[in-house]
Amino acid sequence: STTKCTVSHEVADCSHLKLTQVPDDLPTNITVLNLTHNQLRRLPAANFTRYSQLTSLDVGFNTISKLEPELCQKLPMLKVLNLQHNELSQLSDKTFAFCTNLTELHLMSNSIQKIKNNPFVKQKNLITLDLSHNGLSSTKLGTQVQLENLQELLLSNNKIQALKSEELDIFANSSLKKLELSSNQIKEFSPGCFHAIGRLFGLFLNNVQLGPSLTEKLCLELANT
């Protein structure tokens, strides 16, 4: 192999190698590929054709600004996709449309300021969605009920100012257990905001300046679930 990746037990570690493109000489039977801390700007779908057995792909800490929807067409078994610390700013309906088997999607520390339309609507198996450390101003992730198997929604360190029932009720059929909202500037809990997610096990609000009246409002809304 010309690439200095380490391969062991179907796991390829290609991290910290200053790679500018996906290696094309790794064993075709790898199931885990770590490409973190490189200089990747794109993930051409064609480059993953030979790695169709991947169940986990970690491309964190690169400079990826756009994803080709065809990527997941080449990776039909992919369960974990980690894109943390990249330069993604927009997600479209097509971005993850073929990533139907994902159980974990990590998008923390990108530049996503708004979720438009329904980019996660095909993720029927998703358990963990991490959108922390972005620029999101609301919890709106879609326009229809979806993400029926989601258990963890991580939204800490964003710019969320209000929790609204019309944004959170897309989770009406989901089994959301953990909602992480720490380090946001929450100033409002609108009536019925927790109605659709009443089975929450943990609501995390560390470093959120609640104050007495907002705390009372929060308790009232939680009591009404």
């Epitope: 479209s92 309906d93 029932s165 009720d169 009406a172």
Partner: antibody, heavy 122, light 107 residues
Framework: QVQLQQSGPGLVKPSQTLSLTCAIS??????????WGWIRQSPGRGLEWLGI?????????NYAVSVKSRITINPDTSKNQFSLQLNSVTPEDTAVYYC????????????WGQGTLVTVSS | QSVLTQPPSVSVAPGQTARISCSGD??????VHWYQQKPGQAPVLVIY???ERPSGIPERFSGSNSGNTATLTISGTQAEDEADYYC??????????FGGGTKLTVL
């Protein structure tokens, strides 16, 4: 097989309210897998989207900017239908009005009503 | 996706291939649907989600979408395909944006 049956007057006077109803069979207006809306087509013109309603834990609507101040779309769950109300009509609102079912997840219209020609004239 | 632009008319000889374009800024990032409308009738969905064909729609209808242009292709065009064709997409909060429509004439 889903069917949409429209009803309502074909003639409305200027400044009055246009009211149409769309009765649904083969599906539920409260479905979690579809949305419902209205489109119109002025004589010799293209299709113009007017608005949509969809149910999550509550009902939500979205209206076209061009009619936003005048339009209301309401569900009637007891009769499994939905309605269109367009206030303060003018002759420019003369058109064939269609009700429609939008299929999730990407809002293609897979079923249309038969269309109702509404003329606005005194 | 606020504006979708279609050619007003397209002509094709019977048996030939007709292509109807629908252009819009970065339309390739959105799903496009195509509707066929014959005079005096309600529209009919012929292609959804760029390239999917509803049951009952002939195989000669196909679609593609990338960059700034979506295309409806009718291979081996038949006289019965003469109609108006509309492209459509959605972009919250405008749940439907239609193109201006293209009149397909089968010569």
């Amino acid at each position: 097989q889903v069917q949409l049956q429209q009803s309502g007057p074909g003639l409305v006077k200027p400044s009055q309210t246009l009211s149409l109803t769309c009765a649904i069979s083969g599906d539920s207006v409260s479905s979690n897998s579809a949305a419902w809306g209205w489109i119109r087509q002025s004589p010799g013109r293209g299709l113009e989207w007017l608005g949509i309603i969809q149910k999550r834990s509550k009902w939500y609507n979205n209206y076209a900017v061009s009619v936003k101040s005048r339009i209301t779309i309401n569900p009637d769950t007891s009769k499994n239908q939905f309605s269109l109300q367009l206030n303060s009509v003018t002759p420019e609102d003369t058109a064939v009005y269609y009700c429609a079912r939008y299929s999730y997840p990407f809002y293609s219209i897979d079923y249309w009503g038969q269309g109702t020609l509404v003329t606005v004239s005194s | 996706q606020s504006v979708l632009t279609q050619p007003p008319s397209v002509s094709v000889a019977p048996g030939q291939t007709a292509r109807i374009s629908c252009s819009g800024d970065n339309i390739g990032s959105y799903y496009v649907h195509w509707y066929q409308q014959k005079p005096g009738q309600a529209p009919v969905l012929v292609i959804y989600e760029d390239s999917e064909r509803p049951s009952g729609i002939p195989e000669r209808f196909s679609g593609s979408n990338s960059g700034n242009t979506a295309t409806l292709t009718i291979s081996g065009t038949q006289a019965e395909d003469e109609a108006d064709y509309y492209c459509s997409s959605y972009d919250d909060p405008n749940f439907q944006v239609f193109g201006g429509g293209t009149k397909l004439t089968v010569l």
